[in-house]
Structures are given as C-alpha cells and as structure tokens.
C-alpha cells in the first residue's frame, strides 16, 4: 500500500486522490477511514454512501477514484484507504494520511522581564498562543534570527521606538504579533501599555502613555 501524506487547514474542502490511473475496468472501489470503516463504495455502476460521520459531506468520482470531503475538521485526522477490486479478482490499495490543522491564532506577546543593565536595556519577551504545536520566528533589529517562543535582547540607549514581530506558523497558516518598545527601559516617567491587535489594525504593541493618548485622539 502506497502512503501519501496530506496536511490541510480545518474548514477547507479536500480532494483525496491517487497520482496514478485506476486499474482498468475495476469491479469495485471502496474508500475507508482507518482499516475497515467504509465511507463510500462503488459497485455495479452505483455509489453507496455508508452511515458514517462523513455522510452528506463526501462525494466519489468513480472515474478518477477521487473522494471529495467538504469542511474537514480536526476529528477527520485519519489514514484513508482506497481499495480497488481489479477485474482479475485481486485487490489493490492506496493510503492517504490526512492531517487537519486549525489556523494558528494571533499570538500574544508578554513582557517577561525589562531592566536596566549597565545603561543598556535588557528585554525578555515571550510569544504565547494557546496549546498549539507551532514554529516561532522573531523579526526586528536582532543580531540573528530567533526561532523559539522567547526573545531576549539587550538594547543600547535609543530615542526611537523599536518593534519586534513574532510570527507563529504551522504548515497551513501563520499569524504575526508585534511589540513596539519606547524608551525609557524602566518606565519611571511614563507607563507603557499593551494595546490589542484590533485597536492597532491587527498589530499588538506596547506603547507609552503619551502614544496611547495620541492614538485614541485619532
């Protein structure tokens, strides 16, 4: 049995098919999920759809053997098997391992630590999303690309704000969160606040009280 891997985003419509031609004049074609749970069977020129969680959202194309599934969900994660009974009476099978992933949510950036160290500003940020297995990448004025959920950096004294973007991604989607930092390091003169992504057109920022006031008056 040949095994093909497919990763798709939840809610999408999926086509399960094989990359080769079906055996000529086959007698029967059946799609299963797991070993022996039937979804649909084509026999004697007719398609029979079985009572299963897929009923009403699958369609078989007997010509190509393709199985169309609408609105896949994470619960549809499975190995799908297409078995064909050939005209010589022998069975042939193909397997597709389907992984359905939810789109990643927008990340939340948390300030873990912020302190003065020898006139420089030590900053530790974490990029948080709820219970997901994802990849992280930080972008900004950094010495090297950082590929984990925590960013640690030391900033030399500066007058302008610095922004750091955390990108979270899985194989079907990616989302960004941006943190903008305005001096001073320890907010003695002005308290810095976090503004939601919605407020800032999809970006998440930490800005000064002054900026906040200005932002809300626009």
């Amino acid at each position: 049995g040949r095994l093909v891997h497919m990763t798709v985003v939840s809610g999408s419509n999926v086509t399960l098919n094989i990359s080769e031609s079906l055996p000529e004049n086959y007698k029967q074609l059946t799609w299963f999920y797991t070993f022996d749970q039937k979804i649909v069977e084509w026999d004697s020129g007719k398609s029979k759809y079985f009572e299963s969680k897929f009923k009403g959202r699958v369609r078989l194309d007997p010509q190509s053997g393709a199985l169309y599934i609408s609105k896949v969900q994470k619960e549809d994660n499975s190995t799908y098997v297409m078995r064909v009974l050939k005209k010589d009476g022998y069975e042939q099978e193909w397997k597709i391992k389907l992984q359905v992933l939810d789109p990643v949510p927008k990340p939340v950036i948390k300030i873990e630590k912020r302190e003065d160290v020898d006139d420089n500003c030590y900053l530790k940020l974490s990029c948080v999303i709820p219970g997901e297995s994802v990849n992280y990448t930080w972008y900004g004025e950094l010495p090297k690309e950082i590929q984990n959920s925590v960013l640690e950096t030391t900033l030399k004294p500066h007058k302008h704000s610095r922004c750091y973007t955390c990108q979270v991604s899985n194989s079907v989607s990616s989302k960004n969160g941006t943190f903008c930092f305005s001096p001073p390091c320890t907010a003695a003169r002005s308290e810095q606040k976090l503004i939601s992504e919605e407020d800032l057109g999809g970006e998440q920022k930490l800005i000064s009280e002054e900026d906040l006031h200005h932002h809300h008056h626009h």
Partner: antibody, heavy 118, light 108 residues
Framework: EVQLLESGGGLVHPGGSLRLSCAAS????????MSWVRQAPGKGLEWVSL????????YYADSVKGRFTIFRDNSKNTLYLQMISLRAEDSAVYYC???????????WGQGTLVTVSS | EIVLTQSPGTLSLSPGERVTLSCRAS???????LAWYQQKPGQAPRLLIY???SRATGIPDRFSGSGSGTDFTLTISRLEPEDFAVYYC?????????FGQGTKVEIK
C-alpha cells in the same frame, strides 16, 4: 467451495513463539481481507487481527498489539499469524476467517489449538 | 468500542419450540451492521444472518433476524434437533469488530 485450513498450533511455554498458517482455496485469495479470531476454552469469540486483500494494511486487537504479526502470501494462498512473547491468556483455538467485504466473517476454518503453559 | 450483551446466557428448550435470542449494543450500531453466528461443539462458527435481517447462503428460513439501533433479535421459528448450539452476535458498524458473549440453546 471455499475452504480454510489452519495449522501450526501446539503447546508452548510462556514467552515462547508460534507461527500459525491458514491455507485457502476455492476463491481469489488476494481479493479478500482475512482475519484471525480466537476462542479460549469454554469462552466466547475474540477478534485478534485483520489484513487487507493486498496485505498493505493490518489491524490488531489491543491485547495482542506488538506481539502478534499478521501477514499473507497471495502467491501461496496462505495467511499467517506470527505470535511471540506468548502468555497463558493467549491459550485458545485460533480460527482464520474470510473477512467478507470488510464486514463479517464468512466462512471460518476448523481452527487450531494453541496452549501456553509451563 | 461497542459492547454487545446477549441474553439469556442459556436457554433450555425442546425441539419444535420457538426461540428468541437478544443482543443489545452499548451504543447504536449504524445501518444495522449486525451478524449472527451459530457454533456447535467442536466446530467453527457459521454465519447465519448479516445486515441484522439477511439470511446467509444455505441458511434455512426458520432463522430470522430483526432489530436496529441497539436492540437486535435472532428468532428460530421452530427448533430442530440440529439447532442446539451456541449463538453469537457481532457488530461491524464500527472498529474494532466485537462479539457478544454468546447464548447457549440446550435441549430441555
């Protein structure tokens, strides 16, 4: 007429191994999934393992997973069950059965007795 | 997994009597994917009924099956001497396939 004939059973010590065979005739063997079902003395039927017609997919009961291996040789019309790390609770008559259209078991062989005892 | 419970465990009857065997599933068996088997002492099981109510090839019409969802019945309209045996139900609506524990029909 479809016929299934099991062999290979016998007495084995706990931790030992056995290989059961099932010779099939009277149908296109490679077109059908096959199964092993067992029955402990005086007890009910317990499905053990399944294999697709092509041999490309296998499936096991939790009680035997990692210890039993089902395989087939379609050129010899023969089904096998390799059993290792045998336990007393594996003692049973082992039947091979044609897994009719991936639904029910029909027909069955006459069975072969496996006894695991020290 | 679906658990099948058969009742009664044993039935003591005489030839000519009508028999009703019950098989109850722990959850609904989709599309009545239920089979019945007969097993005589020292023999392999034999398929009697599939799809809850369809008789297998060569099975006499005194055997009939009915039911859906969680409750299924095997009826033998008139017991013949060769019908004394153990009867098992099996569901094939979900994986793994499971069997009931059996009902023994013995001579009174």
């Amino acid at each position: 007429e479809v016929q299934l004939l099991e062999s290979g059973g016998g007495l084995v010590h706990p931790g030992g191994s056995l290989r059961l065979s099932c010779a099939a005739s009277g149908f296109t063997f490679g077109g059908y999934a096959m199964s092993w079902v067992r029955q402990a003395p005086g007890k009910g039927l317990e499905w053990v393992s399944l294999i697709s017609g092509s041999g490309g997919s296998t499936y096991y009961a939790d009680s035997v997973k990692g210890r039993f291996t089902i395989f087939r040789d379609n050129s010899k019309n023969t089904l096998y069950l390799q059993m290792i790390s045998l336990r007393a609770e594996d003692s049973a008559v082992y039947y091979c059965a044609k897994y009719s259209n991936y639904d029910y078991f029909d027909p069955w062989g006459q069975g072969t007795l496996v006894t695991v005892s020290s | 997994e679906i658990v099948l419970t058969q009742s009664p465990g044993t039935l003591s009857l005489s030839p000519g009597e009508r028999v009703t065997l019950s098989c109850r599933a722990s959850q609904s068996v989709s599309s009545s994917y239920l089979a019945w088997y007969q097993q005589k002492p020292g023999q392999a099981p034999r398929l009697l009924i599939y799809g809850a109510s369809s008789r297998a090839t060569g099975i006499p019409d005194r055997f009939s099956g009915s039911g859906s969802g969680t409750d299924f019945t095997l009826t033998i309209s008139r017991l013949e001497p060769e019908d004394f045996a153990v009867y098992y139900c099996q569901q094939y609506g979900s994986s793994p396939r499971t069997f009931g524990q059996g009902t023994k029909v013995e001579i009174k």
